[in-house]
Interface confidence: medium
Amino acid sequence: GLNDIFEAQKIEWHESVRVEQVVKPPQNKTESENTSDKPKRKKKGGKNGKNRRNRKKKNPCNAEFQNFCIHGECKYIEHLEAVTCKCQQEYFGERCGEK
């Protein structure tokens, strides 16, 4: 179920940290690759990704979005295919660039 999927993200939540709008990472050839440590969920087209199970999906935070968050930390929420910034205190905005 979704509970397992969401819990599998293992992303900490801090009420004091303001994090802004999720951004869709650019599509690339790895987008459809399954991640080995994620629980089952329905993939588009019904494919279960058996051949790709042990190939780790690239985290856009380590590539295209490496310097995206100005005053914050980039986080990739895989089940939503989305990048978000965890802003440092007092900073806000999509890229934590506003104070």
């Epitope: 509970n3 992303i11 869709k24 929420i77 989305a82």
Partner: antibody
Amino acid sequence: EVKLVESGGGLVKPGGSLKLSCAASGFTFSSYPMSWVRQTPEKRLEWVATISTGGTYTYYPDSVKGRFTISRDNAKNTLYLQMSSLRSEDTAMYYCARQGPIYYGNYYYAMDYWGQGTSVTVSS
Amino acid sequence: DIVMTQPPLSLPVSLGDQASISCRSSQSLVHSDGNTYLHWYLQRPGQSPKLLIYKVSNRFSGVPDRFSGSGSGTDFTLKISRVEAEDLGVYFCSQSTHVPYTFGGGTKLEIK
């Protein structure tokens, strides 16, 4: 201004199929997960489907699993719901809804904007 | 599935009065991450539902501060401090802690 406009509803016989569309504007469509929710003639709300931003992951309740398929075209800013093997209990107003508010850590998004809905009637 | 119960079906109020709408879930809505994913929507006559409150007590953008949400575990309340004409309609609670997402049957706020 966030705007969601549903279309494609109508009258269909039991066992038939229908494809609903939802045209989105006023926000970066490709950045948001999206959902379909329906409202029965008795005015009860029922979650129907959710799709991730790129369309890779889709989620359904058991009541529609295997019969309904949610999809999206980010280039066209459009969300779809393909419904097949329709039953009388699928008769409802179908709403397209954006998943938000987008705050980090809120994995279980509330539906922050809804369209006006499109009516589906399944009857012989 | 989680059952969301909203008594009463109808709540008659006078404009300017305080209104209190309750919602009860069949299981605790506290998620393992510590958050409680209980939301409130208002559906005005002839309109689609609008988000008022998310995660128990957070007012959505543009929602007046006369609306407030509270509660924990299985019991939740939406309060309207001074009811205005535009507040009339059906209020739905909804949970997204457990799958499938479920909604209450709604409470209709109407003029006494």
